[in-house]
């Protein structure tokens, strides 16, 4: 097992997940370690704990290793690191990676007011409604800015769009969280349409797709949903 | 479905080995990490070793030189070799699969084993 030192003097590993990293519930996750090709070991952790380990045949020129989730449940979400060592150095720790797991207990109600399609510059919230006590509400724009929002509450929660542009145009979901790693099932898709401008934007996105397989995104992490945290939340974190 | 049935526990005194064994139902065998597990009375379950599907091992510090893990890919066998048995080996040792699994990935932490034995009680005393 690793042994922390001062003398880390490798480059940092980059660490990422495929298909994504929001897993269904049962379903299997691929978590892949990139470091260098003389690396004789890989070290994966979760929670800080250490979780797997590979040594790659010195036969195959491979510059990166795959652990394989085979069931995601509550107990494998969360944050995974990974190391590498190359002769007697260890790398620095790879950037985090953040592992949510989807599909528990409940299907919260997503709507949004006044309507699904709207004007441009028109006021738009969205409203995100899970029967089940949760502390936490996450909204999802599926293929669009790469950006998910969350919101405090109980049993509801409100996304104020504000005046709306073509950028918000698109199919969303929401997700309650039992812990930051821990979400529902997702709501049922809306898709918001906005007509009028310059050109005619109210169609919905092409390519729609409902698996949450093709969803990339940061995570913001202040309760505006503004501020993204992209080395925490992308699919490859190396910055 | 993966079953899992732990064999070879036992009394034992200090010094002294056993051989315990894990018998594998089913054809994914070849395709599966296989680790041991301990759990000592009050205490939480431990890792002891494990084995990827390339026979590479790992093995806890605290076991490091006195147990052997091993399998059997033509049996569906995976076995630990105790040998200079302590006391605070005294446990229920739980084999454990992660299957399928691909590469050479050797897994420490129980949350990657998606399955499990019923255990075998392993008791070392004079």
């Known amino acids: 097992q690793r042994i922390n030192t001062e003398k880390e003097t490798l480059p940092k590993p980059i660490i990422w997940a495929k298909p994504s990293i929001m897993v269904t519930n049962g379903n299997s996750v691929n978590i892949w370690c990139q470091g260098a090709q003389s690396a004789s070991e890989y070290q994966l952790y979760f929670e800080g704990s250490f979780f797997a380990l590979e040594r790659p045949k010195p036969s195959r020129s491979m510059n990166k290793v795959r652990f394989f989730i085979s069931q995601m449940t509550s107990h494998t979400a969360g944050i995974y690191t990974c190391f590498y060592q190359s002769g007697e150095l260890w790398s620095k720790s790879s950037n985090p990676l953040k592992l949510v797991v989807t599909g528990l207990y409940d299907t919260p109600n997503l709507w949004v007011y006044p309507r699904p399609e709207v004007t441009l510059g028109e006021n738009v919230t969205f409203f995100c409604q899970l029967k089940t006590a949760t502390s936490k509400f996450f909204l999802l724009k599926e293929r669009g800015s790469n950006h998910i929002q969350n919101k405090y509450g109980n049993i509801q929660a409100e996304f104020p769009m504000g005046p709306v542009t073509r950028a918000h145009r698109g199919t969303y979901r929401c997700f309650g969280s039992y812990n930051d790693y821990a979400w529902s099932f997702p709501s049922e898709p809306v898709t918001l349409l906005i007509t009028g401008g310059v050109e005619n934007s109210s169609l919905a996105p092409t390519d729609p797709t409902s698996s949450l397989d093709y969803w990339e995104f940061d995570l913001s992490t202040n309760e505006s949903g503004l501020q993204k945290d992209s080395a925490f939340w992308d699919h490859t974190t190396q910055n | 479905e993966v079953q899992l049935v732990e064999s070879g526990g036992g009394e034992v005194q200090p010094g002294g080995s056993l051989r315990l064994s894990c018998a594998a139902s089913?054809?994914?065998?070849?395709?599966?990490?296989m680790g041991w597990f301990r759990q000592a009375p009050g205490k939480e379950r431990e890792f002891v070793a494990a084995?990827?599907?390339?026979?590479?091992?790992y093995y806890a510090e605290s076991v490091k030189g006195r147990f052997t893990i091993s399998r059997d890919n033509a049996k569906n066998t995976v076995y630990l070799q105790m040998s200079s048995l302590r006391a605070e080996d005294t446990a229920v040792y739980y084999c454990?699969?992660?299957?399928?699994?691909?590469?050479?990935?050797?897994?420490?932490?129980?949350?990657?084993?998606?399955?499990w034995g019923q255990g075998t009680l392993v008791t070392v005393k004079p």
């Open positions: 454990a699969a992660v299957v399928p699994t691909y590469g050479n990935a050797i897994y420490v932490h129980s949350a990657a084993y998606n399955y």
């Open positions: 089913g054809r994914t065998f070849a395709s599966a990490a």
């Open positions: 084995i990827s599907r390339s026979d590479d091992t």
